[in-house]
């Protein structure tokens, strides 16, 4: 944890005038001027009544204000003479002394009150030196720290009891510990006093540092009895548009030209391509003119633009249908979600004076008219001998963000003579065990003179087709099998070519033993 802070309540080291503590009896402790290790003048107390037995010498400090502290630490510096180095002394010689304290709400002590005894004074500890000295040695200074608490009154006195030692109390320091204000996990925790016991943990509530946001709550840190922080709970993190700095003690705004889209401990990043920021602390970079982000694009994606027009549109006209093919635009706008739309316009009038309008709804586009991924479309059900303009648009995920219409390449075509339309219905005139006689109505739209009809037929069980042609709108199919089901389709032919086959119609031959009687039957498509 962080290093503890110590705040002094009283320190004799800095007192140059008399301390004037109270001693009892007066023949006991004596105030003496001396020098510390650094030869600074100090006030000390000595006692050395070793030749008389039954010593009970008390020394009491002045009143020390508590300052809301619950536990006080006392640092004692002292020297003790080795009893064995003093000749002709009784066995009552001691090398220890006792430390006491007494709490009061004001400076009420006098020469006789409280009574010089344990209870009312509270014993802290018996203090023994680590080293004692003989007459030949320089005094070896011992340093001891003791603590006591919990304290509840306005202040306290310290008291020292000598019971027959030869010693010098060089300095006394009363102090308390506190946890220094600190920053942890992007949260600020205030200076906090330690608790009443060495094992106490005092909760310090935290607040997020500027430009940070809470990510887990509550925010708290525990101050232990030694003035050290421990067990952090909760945390903050840098808000969007801010990055960690100064060892996670600051959240610094992203400088212009950079951004941070998400809160967290990541750094600010340079703006993605084709975007910028004009002010600090940006959580997103705005797109340059004519560049956009699609709704599905994340803040960290580049800004992109619309594609350039498709290239090299080629048309292949076949009667009243055509195939359009084209190449990819030169510039995809920085995106990979390119699609194509095909706009059909039917033109009236001649040459440059022609007016064009949207095509009828019955024009068919395969695989589709809008949102094409492939660079090819088959367009059918156009009118014969008619001029059309087709615009092939290139669009992508940001085309909808642009105020301009999609860019396109156009091609002008004129349709040819159309093939005949579908033969509508087939009629069975007669059937036998080996033949079927069929007729049909001509197509509704012959689109020219019908040269002949082609009939495709197959036995349903075998499924392999044969074809015959007829100049008339009837035919007798021979070489069939009895008791067999046949599927028949017919199409008409003009100079423009074959039309579509009629939808499949089904007929059955009779058994070989059958009469072969005429069966007049109109057969609608299956």
């Amino acid at each position: 944890g962080c290093r503890a802070l110590e705040e002094t309540l009283m320190d004799t080291k800095w007192v140059t005038s008399e301390l004037a503590w109270t001693s009892h009896p007066e023949s006991g402790w004596e105030e003496v001027s001396g020098y510390d290790e650094a030869m600074n003048p100090i006030r000390t107390y000595q006692v050395c009544n070793v030749r008389e037995s039954s010593q009970n010498n008390w020394l009491r400090t002045g009143f020390i204000w508590r300052r809301d502290v619950q536990r006080v630490y006392v640092e004692l510096k002292f020297t003790v003479r080795d009893c064995n180095s003093i000749p002709n002394i009784p066995g009552s010689c001691k090398e220890t002394f006792n430390l006491f304290y007494y709490e009061a709400d004001s400076d009420v002590a006098s020469a006789s009150s409280p009574f010089w005894m344990e209870n009312p004074y509270v014993k802290v500890d018996t203090i023994a030196p680590d080293e004692s000295f003989s007459r030949l040695d320089a005094g070896r200074v011992n340093t001891k720290v003791r603590s006591f608490g919990p304290l509840s009154k306005a202040g306290f006195y310290l008291a020292f009891q000598d019971q027959g030692a030869c010693m010098s109390l060089i300095s006394v320091r009363a102090f308390y510990k506190k946890c220094a204000s600190t920053t942890a996990g992007f949260a600020l925790f205030p200076e906090t006093l330690t608790g009443a016991e060495p094992t106490s943990l005092v909760i310090a509530p935290g607040t997020c540092i500027p430009n940070a946001v809470e990510v887990s709550v509550p925010l708290k840190l525990y101050c232990n009895g030694d003035g050290e922080w421990m067990v952090p709970v909760g945390a903050c993190t840098c808000a969007t548009g801010h990055e960690p700095a100064a060892k996670e003690s600051q959240c610094r705004p992203c400088p212009p030209g950079s951004y941070k889209a998400k809160q967290g401990e990541g750094p600010c990043l340079p703006c993605p391509p084709n975007s910028r920021t004009t002010s600090p602390a940006a959580s997103i970079c705005t797109c340059h003119n004519n560049f956009y982000r699609a709704d599905s694009d994340s803040a960290d994606s580049a800004c992109t633009t619309v594609p350039s027009p498709p290239r090299g549109v080629i048309s292949n006209v076949n009667e009243t249908s055509l195939i359009l093919e084209w190449s990819e635009p030169r510039d995809l706008g920085g995106r990979d979600d390119l699609l194509y739309n095909v706009i059909c316009k039917k033109c009236h009038g001649a040459g440059g004076a022609s007016a064009c309008s949207r095509c009828d709804d019955n024009v068919e586009f395969v695989p589709r008219q809008l949102g094409l991924t492939e660079r090819r479309v088959h367009i059918s059900h156009l009118l014969a001998h008619t001029r059309y303009t087709f615009e092939v648009q290139a669009v992508n995920g940001v085309s909808g963000k642009s105020p301009l219409p999609p860019r396109y390449a156009a091609v002008n075509i004129t349709t040819n003579q159309a093939a005949p339309s579908e033969v509508p219905t087939l009629r069975l005139h007669s059937s036998s065990g080996s033949s079927l006689t069929l007729s049909w109505a001509p197509p509704e739209r012959p689109n020219g003179v019908i040269l002949d009809y082609e009939m495709k037929y197959f036995e349903k069980s075998e499924g392999i087709a044969s074809t015959v042609t007829s100049q008339m709108n009837s035919v007798q199919l021979d070489g069939l099998r009895p008791d067999a089901r046949y599927v028949v389709q017919v199409r008409a032919r003009t100079v423009a070519g074959y039309g579509q086959y009629s939808r499949p119609a089904e007929f059955e031959t009779t058994s070989e033993r059958g009469s072969g009687a005429q069966q007049l039957q109109e057969q609608l498509p299956l």
Epitope: F458, G463, I464, V487
Partner: antibody, heavy 113, light 112 residues
């Protein structure tokens, strides 16, 4: 293009029944008969029967009457063969075919306890 | 039922040479309409049968013209003019004259 997609392999207990499917696509389902053919491991081909999807008219090989039942579902362009009272003799690959020309990939039936 | 008979194995054949596979029927497959309802299939290892010849002598769609069919009413021959490695498999004849449709036992084409 014409496709006949048959259901996956089946492992069935003796005495049970099983229904295998054949989904047709790429042509007018009702215009062609569906045939079913059996092939035992390492053996030749045996014709089971045929069905007209337009009206469910059937022709069975006498040997398979009572063993096989052919049906169709026009709405899903799917033909079915149900095999009942299964024994180890029924363990085979069963093929569906559109007329004489197009065949499915076959379904392996294993009858075992 | 019409019985279709085939030899189990062909004579071993060298790649690039011709091969013939025979089939006999217990009854003439020539219909009064002039069509002979005899079909040839090849079943390659691990695959479904594929149609090669229909109505005795007609080449099915997508089949190389190395294959040809001939015969009389009861004896039929499938000829492969230049055998290739991909032609290996079992060749079946089938009659579609009468119900039930019946298949020959199959002839395995063997390479030298």
């Amino acid at each position: 293009q014409v496709q006949l997609q048959q259901s996956g392999a089946e492992l069935v207990m003796p005495g049970a029944s099983v229904k295998l499917s054949c989904k047709a696509s790429g042509y007018t389902f009702t215009s062609y008969y569906i045939h079913w053919v059996k092939q035992r491991p390492g053996q030749g081909l045996e014709w089971i029967g045929e069905i007209d999807p337009s009206d469910s008219y059937t022709n069975y090989n006498q040997k398979f009457k009572g063993k096989a039942t052919l049906t169709v579902d026009k709405s899903s362009s799917t033909a079915y063969i149900q095999l009942s009272s299964l024994t180890s003799e029924d363990s085979a690959v069963y093929y569906c075919a559109r007329g004489a020309e197009y065949w499915g990939q076959g379904t392996t039936l294993t009858v075992s306890s | 039922d019409i019985v279709m008979t085939q030899a189990a194995f062909s004579n071993p054949v060298t790649l690039g040479t011709s091969a013939s596979i025979s089939c006999r029927s217990s009854k003439s497959l020539l219909h009064s309409n002039g069509i002979t309802y005899l079909y040839w299939y090849l079943q390659k290892p691990g695959q479904s049968p594929q149609l090669l010849i229909y109505r005795m002598s007609n080449l099915a769609s997508g089949v190389p013209d190395r294959f040809s069919g001939s015969g009389s009413g009861t004896a039929f021959t499938l000829r492969i003019s230049r055998v290739e490695a991909e032609d290996v498999g079992v060749y079946y004849c089938m009659q579609h004259l009468e119900y039930p449709l019946t298949f020959g036992g199959g002839t395995k084409l063997e390479l030298k």
